[in-house]
């Protein structure tokens, strides 16, 4: 069977070769070929070429669509690490340091304080804040951590809030707050973390972090 297939392939190849040679002869205007024959052969060849080109275009389109499909849903994720700051602001500062993540330019850390997204969609946003406080040294008010959203054309909005009472441990007791939820973000929206007393936040490795993930 294989031998017969081989003979068949060789015969087809020979026919193709003869066909190509005939086109060549037509082009050089050899007297032995009639004009009618040449016209027929030429139009046949043009048909083949057209088919080949159309196939090529289709493949190109499919490939570019695949690329677009991939581009439409790239992974968007960020995880940033807390940074001690001399600023008295209640907004926590973050840095791209240690074991951080910044998937691509569709999410950016702006002014060290907010994560800004370029694409609309549902995002899981989270923050862990570890703080060390003492009941006697602190005010009566609990330690509050807030996850806030600022979108273009809108006032900032609190998405999530958590409160912990101060520890009685001396000099201070470590406690952690974890906030996390799924929210619809618009292009240009920024999320940031606010705390009642930034001086009590622990910046040791792994204690305080902030991030998001596009679902």
């Amino acid at each position: 069977h294989r031998r017969l297939d081989k003979i068949e392939d060789e015969r087809n190849l020979h026919e193709d070769f003869v066909f190509m040679k005939t086109i060549q002869r037509c082009n050089t205007g050899e007297r032995s070929l009639s004009l009618l024959n040449c016209e027929e052969i030429k139009s046949q060849f043009e048909g083949f070429v057209k088919d080949i080109m159309l196939n090529k275009e289709e493949t190109k389109k499919e490939n570019s669509f695949e690329m677009q499909k991939g581009d439409q849903n790239p992974q968007i994720a960020a995880h940033v690490i807390s940074e001690a700051s001399s600023k008295t602001t209640s907004v926590l500062q973050w840095a791209e340091k240690g074991y951080y993540t910044m998937s691509n330019n569709l999410v950016t850390l702006e002014n060290g304080k907010q994560l800004t997204v370029k694409r609309q969609g549902l995002y899981y946003i989270y923050a862990q804040v570890t703080f060390c406080s003492n009941r006697e040294a602190s005010s009566q008010a609990p330690f509050i951590a807030s996850l806030c959203l600022k979108s273009p054309g809108r006032f900032e909005r609190i998405l999530l809030r958590a409160a912990n009472t101060h520890s009685s441990a001396k000099p201070c007791g470590q406690q952690s707050i974890h906030l996390g939820g799924v929210f619809e973000l618009q292009p240009g929206a920024s999320v940031f973390v606010n705390v009642t007393d930034p001086s009590q936040v622990s910046h040791g490795t792994g204690f305080t972090s902030f991030g998001l993930l596009k679902l």
């Epitope: 806030c148 273009p152 054309g153 809108r154 006032f155 900032e156 909005r157 609190i158």
Partner: antibody, heavy 119, light 107 residues
Framework: EVKLVESGGGLVKPGGSLKLSCTTS????????MSWVRQTPEKRLEWVAS???????YYPDSVRGRFTISRDNARNILYLQMSSLRSEDTAMYYC?????????????WGQGTSVTVSS | DIQMTQSPASLSASVGETVTITCRAS??????LAWYQQKQGRSPQLLVY???TLAEGVPSRFSGSGSGTQFSLKINSLQPEDFGSYYC?????????FGTGTKLELK
């Protein structure tokens, strides 16, 4: 039905103080950003102050340091404490609710309270 | 600060006519523009936000258009209750600023 009712306006001397109130009903007050907007005698509208649902406050340069916006979520009241008043603060003061909780556009306005600063 | 320039300052028209009021921002505000109507002795009322979205209860004869820095409010087939003053306001960022107003009077 959303209702906003301003009060506390009146005649005050330059350098004096006044506290405006806006009593609200018909919506969940603490979920919305609220603002004060004034209309001058020449009918120009000027933004005066805003407070977000998270209690962040915003002011234009013309009133920053002189005016303070605050809210009492338990009583559904918005306040504007005005001090060091000037003649250019003379206007009709409106309180307004922000559309869709936190948009900068304002969908409901009160009937206004008049403030005149004059010696 | 973003300056909002409104024109014309005043306009006379008859019932049934179509009028257009324009508003220009000193820098791009994308589609963050609102239009308000104020009748004599009353408080302003939101007509349009996000440049073209009609507020609840606003008749369809009102329409907003534009983006970037150029915006317009069109009122088709004017009704007696449409006469009054109209203000644009950018709602892109703070400070919030309003246009100077357009007084629409009955011809």
């Amino acid at each position: 039905e959303v209702k906003l009712v301003e009060s506390g306006g009146g005649l005050v001397k330059p350098g004096g103080s006044l506290k405006l109130s806006c009593t609200t009903s018909g919506f969940t007050f603490n979920n919305y950003a609220m603002s004060w907007v004034r209309q001058t005698p020449e009918k120009r509208l000027e933004w005066v102050a805003s407070i977000s649902s998270g209690d962040s406050t915003y002011y234009p340069d013309s009133v920053r340091g002189r005016f303070t916006i605050s809210r009492d979520n338990a009583r559904n009241i918005l306040y504007l404490q005005m001090s060091s008043l000037r003649s250019e603060d003379t206007a009709m003061y409106y309180c307004a609710r922000h559309y869709d909780y936190d948009s900068y556009a304002m969908d409901y306005w009160g009937q206004g309270t008049s403030v005149t600063v004059s010696s | 600060d973003i300056q909002m320039t409104q024109s014309p300052a005043s306009l006379s028209a008859s019932v049934g006519e179509t009028v257009t009021i324009t508003c220009r921002a000193s820098e791009t505000i994308y589609s963050y523009l609102a239009w308000y109507q104020q009748k004599q002795g009353r408080s302003p009322q939101l007509l349009v936000y996000n440049a073209k979205t009609l507020a609840e209860g606003v008749p369809s004869r009102f329409s907003g258009s534009g983006s970037g820095t150029q915006f317009s409010l069109k009122i088709n087939s004017l009704q007696p209750e449409d006469f009054g003053s109209y203000y644009c306001q950018h709602h892109y960022n703070t400070p919030l600023t309003f246009g100077t107003g357009t007084k629409l009077e009955l011809k």
